[in-house]
Interface confidence: low
């Protein structure tokens, strides 16, 4: 029978009285339009909706907007338009909220044509106060925040100019001109390209790539010829063209683009890009386009300095003309990402690595589904998850896979089974050990989200039609219970809850549609009474994360340690709370080949752990460019992988030596690097 | 060995209605999606109907929608196509098929359903 | 609606010929197609799916290819118990999943 039918399903006692006591509708007295959501901080119960409404007229468009504000967590609203003395926002923008529990808020006004610059309202006591701000540019982008101080803002004008605000936008400085992109670093440092001869786009590959770290007092220029660049983790990239041709290659920097090396990653041409999939302080996975509109690639990932890379994964799928690629970190246990691949047939297939890409299997088949038509042989196939490219493609699902890093091991996903991803009404399953074993949890499309860190899973059927029913589970998906939250069905347009996950609050938005009107309208619905108390230590049990041979000493060793959970009970039903935190005891592994990548120069057979020289570099000397220097490698075939805490066993030798020799790569040398001043 | 059984055919009258079932046997039935195919003395295939394992979603032609609909009952392993408001050009064998994602893998002997007065 | 295209409509053989049906769709498809055979009095029977895997049972001669929007079932050398109406059919995306208007193979 389907989930949620056996009969050893427990059911909550009494729960549709105890939802229907804790279920908030609110009707915003609004024409449909768009509505954007935002919270505001965390765990405040702040909530900002704006929503917007164009008319059009003949000859130009009128704009209405509104402006709620809750502190309830959506329970209740209030008109707080004239706040913002009733302005028009220009929703491309958003809602820029600041950074961590900041509490500020700044938001961008439509301004008529003739106007100097543009306008916005910029409130720091959680959007209960806002103070209007003339600008002296027409903003082109948000308002971004600098990490480290919220106080700082930086934006671009429509007349490319950099400017830079250090009173949370109450006076503003232009720093620079004919600026292209611009981002904050660390230490509210600013990375920038600029353009020389008229346009970004004209001069795409001949941008400079510049840095302040005193807010536009001194810049210092640290990179030419520049095609774009990019920050992730402590890692500085820049796409750099080379001198022959039109192609380019990527250099990497970690001291914020003093010293640059030529990243060992092949070049590509015009019609190619290079993206940074996933970044940490350890290590970053690059996806390089294949020549040709293929729609694939390879992935490699890097060692710690971001400039030796190993081949993780052919054919990864990446479309160059939407820009969709299913490369999805699972964030409820470590080392585990999820991405497709677009095998020789041009059929789309999901992999999986659970060791931050240093092996890459598909999904194992659920225990309760069967084989789509897709599987050549009926008995042995695989789970394929839909992610951006399948809501690319119209396909219908309606959310990409979700995990919480506080819900350890939990994985919710839509996909089908067989030996590719099939165009068939996915259904939704789960997986409650960080993708190594899945079960069917919902038949069709449904949205979901987690609650409590993953004490209660809620889901809503995804339909044309009008709905009024939400489903919920507290075990992990495996039983669930449905409950009308509203007499009159609604058109359902999303859900919502806290980022974090640690909530018991969802908010069902959606309108309703009379002969006249459409209205918003949003249900919030407190599951605090279905949890009645708060867990025990009794409630938890131990878990050994990638665990898969218990008799194995080294079993659940991933990076060279092991990581024991303490987990929810599935029967157990009761609060983990807002103040809950993952308790884990990680102990170190023995060091195997497998804590160890390929070299430079080296490669791992398929189903093999150990590392042999790459047959066209047999027998020559391993050289390459580091920090402007050559350097000779020796090796006998091992890196460790960033990130690995293993200790004794297995320990080859590695050893780089400087040739000094000079190379160049085609960035200014470090000694020729220029600085200026304001 | 799988084998799907139509049955429910015969002659109706042009505005007429008729249900017609499928029997399903040696596979698990509630795990598949089904499908309906008919075809017209002569003609080809054309795709009627399909639903989901659980019965949750329905799909059919723009021709067809409001007059046909699919439905199954997975404790009784069988499918079934309600006819209603028949036409002549309704005339033809009905193929009910097992429709597992990118194919309909197993298919039944057919039920002939005229529409003639 | 996506297009199916089949050509050709019918086609004279001899036994051991190789032959050839094409399959061309209005837009990429990414794949997602199956050949049909079907005898006449017979219902149709499954040969290929995802445009290249082979159905249980279907015999080797037998051949799927293509990608994109044009797709070709082969049969390498004809048997007479080859003679039929061939059809393809598409599932990408939201349905109707239209069929080809059928291939005849008759025997020369």
């Known amino acids: 029978s389907a989930p949620g039918e056996d009969e050893e399903c427990g059911r909550v006692r009494d729960f549709v009285a105890k939802l229907a006591n804790n279920t908030h509708q609110h009707v915003f007295d609004d024409l449909r339009g768009s509505v954007s959501l935002s919270w505001v901080g965390d765990s405040t119960g702040v909530i900002l909706v704006l929503t917007t409404f164009h008319v059009p007229l003949v000859i130009m468009t009128f704009g209405q907007s509104k402006l709620y504000r809750s502190e309830d967590y959506g329970k209740n609203f209030k008109d707080i338009t004239d706040l913002i003395n009733n302005t028009f926002i220009r929703t491309e923008f958003g809602m820029a909220i600041g950074p961590e529990n900041s509490g500020k808020v700044v938001l961008t006004a439509e301004v008529s044509g003739g106007s100097r610059g543009g306008r916005i309202f910029r409130s720091s006591d959680f959007a209960k106060n806002f103070v209007q701000t003339d600008l002296p540019f027409h903003p082109l982008t948000q308002m971004m925040y600098s990490p480290q101080n919220s106080d700082y803002l930086l934006a671009l004008s429509t007349e490319n100019g950099l400017w830079v605000s250090k009173n949370f936008g109450g006076k503003w400085e232009e720093i620079h001109k004919a600026v292209c992109l611009a981002k904050w670093g660390s230490d509210n440092t600013i990375f920038f390209t600029t353009y020389a001869n008229g346009s970004c786009k004209a001069d795409l590959g001949a941008l400079e790539l510049w840095r302040t770290s005193d807010l536009g007092k001194s810049f210092k220029t640290i990179g030419v010829k520049i095609y774009s660049f990019g920050l992730g983790g402590r890692f500085l990239f820049a796409s750099v063209m080379a001198d022959k041709d039109t192609t380019r290659r990527i250099h990497v920097s970690t001291d914020q683009g003093d010293t640059w090396s030529m990243a060992q990653l092949p070049s590509v041409g015009q019609e190619q890009f290079y993206s940074i999939l996933a970044a940490n302080d350890d290590m970053v996975f690059m996806h390089v386009d294949e020549p040709g509109d293929t729609g694939f690639g390879t992935i490699f990932t890097s060692d710690d300095r971001g400039i030796v890379y190993s081949k993780s994964l052919d054919r990864h799928l990446y479309t160059t003309t939407g820009g969709e690629t299913d490369f999805t970190n699972v964030t409820s246990l470590r080392g585990v990402y999820i991405t497709s691949v677009l095998s020789e047939d041009n059929s789309i297939q999901t992999m999986i690595t659970f060791d931050q890409g240093g092996r890459w299997t598909h999904l194992r088949k659920p225990e309760n589904s069967e084989c789509d038509a897709t599987a050549k042989n009926k008995n042995e196939c695989s789970l394929h998850i839909h992610a951006s490219y399948s809501i690319s493609q119209k396909l219908n699902v309606p959310m990409a896979p979700l995990s919480e890093p506080n819900a350890v091991g939990i994985v919710i996903a839509h996909g089908s089974v067989g030996d590719a991803i099939s165009v068939m009404v996915p259904d939704v399953y789960i997986s409650d050990d960080g993708g190594y074993s899945w079960t069917k949890m919902l038949e069709g499309p449904h949205y979901y989200t987690i609650l409590d860190s993953g004490g209660i899973i809620v889901a809503i059927e995804h339909s044309s039609r009008p709905i009024n029913v939400i489903k919920f589970s507290t075990d992990e998906g495996q039983c669930w219970q449905t409950y009308t939250f509203t007499r009159d069905p609604i058109y359902f347009t999303g859900l919502a809850s806290e980022p974090g996950a640690r909530s018991m609050n969802i908010s069902i938005w959606g309108f309703t549609e009379s002969f006249l009107t459409s209205q918003w309208v949003s249900y919030t619905i407190d599951f605090k009474d279905i949890l009645e108390r708060n867990c025990e230590e009794k409630d938890y049990t131990i878990w050994l994360a990638h665990s898969t041979d218990p008799e194995d000493y080294e079993d659940g060793c991933i990076l060279g340690y092991k990581e024991q959970f303490l987990r929810l009970r599935k029967s157990s039903v009761c609060q983990n709370g807002r103040d809950y935190v993952v308790t884990k005891q990680p102990s170190i592994c023995l060091c195997s080949l497998e804590d160890f990548l390929c070299d430079f120069g080296y490669y791992r057979p398929e189903n093999d752990s150990k590392c042999v020289e790459q047959p066209e570099l047999k027998g020559h000397d391993l050289e390459f460019c580091l920090y402007g220097r050559e350097e000779h490698l020796t090796t006998n075939g091992y890196r460790k992988i960033p990130g690995d805490k293993c200790q004794g066993g297995v320990n080859p030798v590695r050893e780089v030596k400087d040739l000094k020799k000079k190379c160049t790569s085609n960035f200014l040398s470090p000694e020729k690097q220029n600085s200026k001043s304001n | 060995e799988v084998q799907l059984v139509e049955s429910g055919g015969g002659l109706v009258q042009p505005g007429g209605s008729l249900r017609l079932s499928c029997a399903a046997s040696?596979?698990?039935?509630?795990?598949?999606?089904m499908s309906w195919v008919r075809q017209a003395p002569g003609k080809g295939l054309e795709w009627v109907a399909t639903?989901?394992?659980?019965?949750?979603?329905?799909y059919y032609p723009d021709i067809l929608k409001g007059r046909f609909t699919i439905s199954r009952d997975n404790a009784k392993n069988s499918l079934y196509l309600q006819m209603n408001s028949g036409r002549a050009e309704d005339t033809a064998v009905y193929y009910c098929?097992?429709?597992?994602?990118?194919?309909?893998?197993?298919w039944g002997q057919g039920t002939l359903v005229t529409v003639s007065s | 609606d996506i297009q199916m295209t089949q050509s050709p409509s019918s086609l004279s053989a001899s036994v051991g010929d190789r032959v050839t049906i094409t399959c061309r769709v209005s837009?990429?498809?990414?794949?997602?197609l199956a050949w049909y055979q079907q005898k006449p009095g017979k219902s149709p029977k499954l040969l290929v799916y995802?445009?290249?895997n082979l159905a249980d049972g279907v015999p080797s001669r037998f051949s799927g290819s293509g990608s994109g929007t044009d797709y070709t079932l082969t049969i390498s050398s004809l048997q007479p118990e080859d003679f039929a109406t061939y059809y393809c059919?598409?599932?990408?995306?939201?349905?109707?999943?239209?069929f080809g208007q059928g291939t005849k193979l008759e025997i020369k």
């Open positions: 995802a445009a290249t």
């Open positions: 639903i989901s394992s659980g019965g949750i979603y329905t």
């Open positions: 098929a097992r429709h597992p994602g990118g194919a309909m893998d197993y």
């Open positions: 040696g596979f698990t039935f509630n795990i598949y999606g």
């Open positions: 837009e990429n498809i990414y794949s997602n």
């Open positions: 059919q598409h599932f990408w995306g939201t349905p109707p999943w239209t």
